[in-house]
């Protein structure tokens, strides 16, 4: 028998520094978690003690904090190199700055293989990107070899900016021939490492012949055997065992997100490369694990540029940006309009001639807008200003909802109107009319939404049975502010970009902004 220890991370999303327990900014260091310095301590401890250790990342290192905004992926390459990762799969967010924003800072600088079998380059890009990422890599581990085959969500063109010269194929269809190729090379221990979400991870385990282990990401899935050590509730046991179509027991793992845990999976193989046993658990990277001093010193060195950046001007406003709770929790506010416009702009993807865009709608809880920005400071807007408006370090995500769910959400928006509660929705690509004289649950009298399958966007009445794409804060996607119907009824959920980053990018792009209150949200009384 031969033992392999797989250490894995996924969806780290730019959390290079330690964070609070909820993965936001670290406030009380004695209770903080994660970060690359702490991760390195744990990884090195395991490497020193155990044989045959692989450190793998299942994608989405990019995007999530000011680290990515400023360093644009150079920080990922630098610190992943320092931690001596053995391989990484491409996630959808690795394409957020376009293909160039992946090639230059990461693909060219990484000292470890970066993998995806289902991304195929075409046209002029094919030669430019050739060899910079691979479908698979055979890694020597001790006296044996292990094949790692990568995959990436085929939804990436809708979630990021991969451009027109990358084709995202079906994961299973693309993986099988690569696994077959590894088998012909006498590689009999094969790990599928990828970023398509837990449901696809399980399908790969079931359908792709020859895959021994699946290490996934994208869905931020927390698996655990026994009593979980923090707030995350397990979606199943670690590892999650899938019985493949050819009768093998295939372990599937994921390690939540944000570098809070280090996945730890111990696999025992027989001499023919069959998995005899698998066990382990994610390791909570809490403050009992010290931060490695040399990595921490490096983090502090890189940190200096971030502090400078946060006070630099991103753009100007020539109007007062009303982010006050007195406005945003009671009526349409222009800060809400600005943020929603930025959210839609960040999701412009012309992937189909029939659609001007794949998504046109935004909703945003007014309680998530925490500060106004005064234009009388020479109109200057800085990252620091935006951090006061959006202090929670959330993301703006893409969901698919039925019209009926949206209607319920808008009813919830005003079900206790007048109490300055956070659930009042700011919008984009939506015209809503409320009649507050009606009883709660029946106050939405008009709900029109901007078409997507049209050359000239216009507002049409919401259809209850139609499925719509909507951009919203992850807080709402997770049922926050009482929006349980969104969490319970959403048909798809893909995590998006850091909230501040979305707005800052938009302001930088527009240079001068002047959002207005323009009748997106109206109130009527009596018959409509």
């Amino acid at each position: 028998a031969w033992e392999l220890t797989i250490l894995h991370t996924n969806d780290v999303h730019s959390r290079l520094e330690q964070t609070s327990e909820d993965s936001s900014k670290c406030v009380n260091a004695s209770r903080c978690m994660g970060g690359v310095a702490r991760l390195f301590t744990k990884v090195q401890q395991i490497r020193r003690a155990e044989p045959n250790v692989l450190l793998l990342d299942a994608g989405d290192q990019y995007q999530g904090t000011i680290w990515f905004t400023v360093y644009k992926g150079a920080e990922v390459a630098h610190f992943m190199n320092a931690l001596r990762y053995d391989a990484m799969a491409l996630g959808n967010h690795e394409f957020d700055n376009g293909v160039e924003g992946l090639i230059e800072p990461l693909l060219k600088e990484a000292k470890f293989p970066i993998l995806s079998a289902n991304i195929k380059a075409k046209g002029p890009l094919a030669s430019q990107i050739s060899g910079l990422y691979l479908p698979y890599k055979v890694l020597p581990v001790g006296d044996e070899v292990v094949g790692i085959v990568g995959y990436t969500s085929k939804e990436t063109p809708f979630l990021s900016n991969p451009g027109t010269n990358l084709v995202f194929e079906d994961e299973i269809t693309a993986l099988q021939p690569e696994v077959d190729k590894l088998k012909t090379l006498n590689v009999n221990k094969i790990i599928a490492l990828g970023h398509s979400g837990f449901e696809m991870d399980k399908l790969i385990a079931q359908k792709v012949r020859g895959v021994d282990v699946v290490v996934g990401g994208h869905s931020n899935t927390f698996l655990y055997t026994g009593n979980p050590p923090s707030k995350e509730v397990p979606a199943g046991k670690y590892p999650f065992i899938v019985t493949s179509d050819d009768g093998r027991k295939v372990p599937v793992v994921q390690a939540y997100a944000f570098g809070k845990y280090l996945g730890y999976l111990k696999i025992e193989f027989d001499e023919r490369g069959n998995v005899i046993s698998s066990h382990g658990n994610p390791i909570l990277l809490n403050s009992s694990i010290p931060e490695d001093p040399s990595i921490k010193a490096d983090i502090n060195k890189w940190r200096i540029k971030l502090d400078n950046y946060s006070t630099q001007e991103l753009g100007k406003t020539i109007v007062y940006l009303d982010g006050s709770s007195q406005s945003c929790r009671f009526r349409e506010c222009n800060m809400g309009n600005l943020i929603c416009d930025a959210m839609i702009n960040n999701n412009l993807r012309h992937t189909d001639e029939m659609f001007w865009n794949h998504v046109s709608m935004c909703i945003l809880n007014g309680g998530g807008i925490r500060s106004p920005i005064d234009e009388r400071n020479n109109g200057t807007i800085t990252w620091e200003n935006l951090a006061a408006v959006l202090p929670f370090g959330g993301t703006f995500d893409l969901v698919q909802l039925k019209g009926s769910t949206l209607k319920k959400a808008f009813e919830h928006s005003v079900h206790r109107y007048g109490q300055s509660t956070g659930e009042f929705l700011q919008v984009g690509g939506i015209h809503v009319v409320y009649d507050l004289s009606r009883k709660p649950g029946d106050r939405v009298v008009k709900l029109d939404v901007l078409c997507t399958k049209c050359r000239v966007p216009s507002y049409d009445p919401l259809k209850m049975d139609e499925v719509y794409k909507v951009i919203l804060p992850n807080f709402l996607a997770n049922g926050g502010d009482g929006f349980q119907m969104i969490k319970d009824e959403l048909l798809r959920h893909d995590s998006g970009d850091q909230d501040i980053n979305v707005v800052s990018t938009y302001i930088s792009k527009m240079k001068v902004i002047y959002p207005a209150v323009e009748g997106r949200i109206k109130f009527s009384t009596g018959s409509h």
Epitope: T41, Q45, R48, A49, E50, G142, N281, S288, I289, P290
Partner: antibody
């Protein structure tokens, strides 16, 4: 400062088994890997295996598989090594040694002397 | 099994003399650790990761090397340095120790 206190010397007959202990104090016992090392009289050191008290995961030098068995009792912060089917070749001093967060075998017990004699 | 061969097996040095002992690996490794053991006591971590001195180790000690060849050097021998020194690798499983170099004071 981490301290590892090992059990006293053992005189055992050939074919018998022996179980020695290594009690940790001064650290979070479960957080550090613990190793066992053999030193025959006047000879060098031989690594036997490791155990990670947190999970009970262990690994062995192939040479000692079947000879040594490593276990832990988290409640008493104590690691154990049992040696089976003893022969004169097993007469030696056996050390437990703990990794720290940053270094291999940073802390050592005082050793347990095992003498196999009829 | 990766074999570590230490040389010389036994050596003696006068106080103030420079001392170098070597450890040769049967195949290339990433790092070397060194332990000091005085008679009747447990080994002590002396040098980690090829060149990092353990806390309390005098600055006259140094470690260097790469690939298959590593060494421990004492710039100026002192009486308290008399001991046996073992090299130890964790690059290839199972972890192994060298046969030791016994350093005596003249």
């Amino acid at each position: 400062e981490v301290q590892l206190q090992q059990s006293g010397p053992e005189l055992v007959k050939p074919g018998a088994s022996v179980k020695m202990s290594c009690k940790a104090s001064g650290n979070i016992f479960t957080d550090y890997y613990l190793h066992w090392v053999k030193q025959s009289h006047g000879k060098s050191l031989e690594w036997i295996g490791y155990i990670y008290p947190n999970t009970g995961v262990n690994g062995y030098n192939q040479k000692f598989k079947g000879k040594a068995s490593l276990t832990v009792d988290k409640s008493s912060s104590t690691a154990y090594m049992e040696l089976r089917s003893l022969t004169s070749e097993d007469s030696a001093v056996y050390y437990c040694a703990s990794d720290s967060w940053f270094f291999a075998m940073d802390y050592w017990g005082q050793g347990t002397s095992v003498t196999v004699s009829s | 099994l990766l074999v570590l061969t230490q040389s010389p097996a036994i050596m003696s040095a006068s106080p103030g003399e420079k001392v170098t002992m070597t450890c040769s690996a049967s195949s290339s490794i990433n790092d070397m650790n060194w332990f000091q053991q005085r008679p009747g006591t447990s080994p002590k971590r002396w040098i980690s990761d090829t060149s990092k001195l353990a806390s309390g180790v005098p600055a006259r000690f140094s470690g260097s090397g790469s690939g298959t060849s590593y060494s421990l050097t004492i710039s100026s021998m002192e009486a308290e340095d008399a001991a046996t020194y073992y090299c130890h690798q964790r690059s290839s499983y199972p972890w192994t120790f060298g046969g030791g170099t016994k350093l005596e004071i003249k």
